[in-house]
């Protein structure tokens, strides 16, 4: 048994690092390997994490940690039964992708305007909390042609656009992304899409 | 009441061997790590040793390495400390103390908040 | 290893008045914001030690709020309001952010 592709980490900057990995030929992943991690501190013990699949040849092990500090190291063994298929050391604040924004809502209520709402993803006494930016793709099912990246660098998570620079009468998609410029992190996952109908008309003077 | 009890001290010769216990009552004995501080007559404390929760990680003074062990026996909430190949600078009083809870991912510091009253170990011909 | 230096290693003081320690570590004992892996301890005569401060700055259980802790990364200071006769005692800092554990010398604090 082999690895193809060493484990590569992320760490959400709050509680949970994702490891993922390709072995040499289709395994079981939860059956077969185990990946264990120690916190390189006074004391810390070993813990396992027990991997999915991820694909025929893939595995991804999502790894409970405490909060994440600059000084926190891990030592990473990969474990095929007794033998060590892989050992290497993994910096969570080195290596951070955000968690996703959530509870991405659209109110077409607002005169002229669209409103998108969100959620961020981190509690207020979290690092990241502000310091996320994020990126709002907004596109059409009805016109492919028809896609942007709206990008919002300041602290709100809200994008208001003026309604008329939409079509009206179709239907349009948006979802979020976010990542922490100081931090140095990759962009999150987006969040789910949701989708509302513009049935925003010109006033008859403008037309 | 959270107490910690040490017994095994005594006299014993130069080259000789003692095993240190630690009974722990009153916490969740597994869940810390403990410690073994010794003072010898006269002196300062001097850190000897730390055991984590689970025992996995095992800690010792260069003045001991390769002579003590360390150890821990969670069913019967007991910490050891075996020492061996004694010299006449192991003399002193051994305390064993509390230390961190270890079964989070890192360990929670609250000090060495409980300690026994001390066995005296005396090694001498 | 890390070094703790202690000063003074001898403090006569009167009851009622402050009293103040200081430790030195040879390396930063920071380890995240707030948590400096210092703490104080007290032995008094024939007993055990026992914790006065972990962490820089937390006050043990039971431990009386004259006795309060302060400072960050290599200097640390203990510091009795207002020393009462059930103080004196030899008062040791010690470092745990890494193994070996290391204690300063030991500070004895007497009554004047």
């Known amino acids: 048994m082999k690895v193809l592709q060493e484990p590569a980490c992320v760490s959400d900057y709050m509680s949970i690092s994702t490891c993922e990995w390709k072995m040499g030929g289709p395994t079981n992943c939860s059956a077969e390997l185990r990946l264990l991690y120690q916190l390189v501190f006074q004391s810390s013990e070993t813990h396992t994490c027990v991997p999915e699949n991820n694909g025929g040849v893939g595995c991804v092990c999502h790894l409970l940690m405490d909060d994440v500090v600059s000084m926190d190291n891990y030592t990473l063994d990969l474990w095929a039964g007794q033998q060590l298929l892989w050992k290497g050391s993994f910096k969570p604040s080195e290596h951070v992708k955000p968690r996703a924004p959530g509870n991405l809502t659209v109110h077409t209520n607002v005169s002229d305007t669209v409103l998108l709402t969100w959620s961020n993803p981190y509690p207020p006494d979290n690092y990241l909390y502000n310091d996320l930016t994020y990126a709002v793709n907004i596109w059409s099912e009805n016109d492919p042609a028809y896609s942007r990246i709206h990008n919002v660098t300041y602290l709100k998570p809200t994008l208001r656009i003026p309604a008329s620079t939409l079509k009206s009468g179709i239907s349009y998609r948006a979802r979020v992304r976010a990542w922490a410029q100081h931090y140095n992190t990759t962009w999150s996952e987006w969040s789910p899409s949701t989708k509302w109908y513009n049935s925003y008309r010109e006033p008859f003077e403008q037309r | 009441e959270v107490q910690l009890v040490e017994s095994g001290g005594g006299l014993e010769q130069p080259g000789g061997s003692l095993r240190l216990s630690c009974a722990g009552s009153?916490?969740?004995?597994?869940?810390?790590?403990m410690t073994w501080v010794r003072q010898a007559p006269g002196k300062g404390l001097e850190w000897v040793s730390s055991?984590?929760?689970?025992?996995?990680?095992?800690y010792y003074a260069d003045s001991v390495k390769g002579r003590f062990t360390i150890s821990r026996d969670n069913s019967k909430n007991t910490l050891y400390l075996q020492m061996n190949s004694l010299r006449a600078e192991d003399t002193a009083v051994y305390y064993c103390a509390k230390d961190r809870l270890s079964v989070t991912v890192r360990p929670r510091y609250y000090g060495l908040d409980v300690w026994g009253q001390g066995t005296t170990v005396t090694v001498s011909s | 290893d890390i070094v703790m230096t202690q000063s003074p290693l001898s403090l006569p003081v009167t009851p009622g008045e402050p009293a103040s320690i200081s430790c030195r570590s040879s390396?930063?004992?920071?380890?995240?914001?707030?948590?400096?892996?210092v703490d104080w301890y007290l032995q008094k005569s024939g007993q055990s030690p026992q914790l006065l401060i972990y962490l820089g700055s937390q006050r043990a259980t039971g431990v009386p709020d004259r006795f309060s802790g302060s400072g960050s990364g290599t200097d640390f200071t203990l510091k009795i309001s207002r020393v009462e006769a059930e103080d004196v005692g030899f008062y040791y800092c010690m470092q745990s952010l890494t193994s070996p554990y290391t204690f300063g010398q030991g500070t004895k604090l007497e009554i004047k």
């Open positions: 390396q930063s004992v920071l380890y995240s914001i707030g948590k400096n892996y």
């Open positions: 009153g916490f969740t004995f597994r869940d810390f790590a």
């Open positions: 055991i984590s929760g689970g025992g996995g990680s095992t």
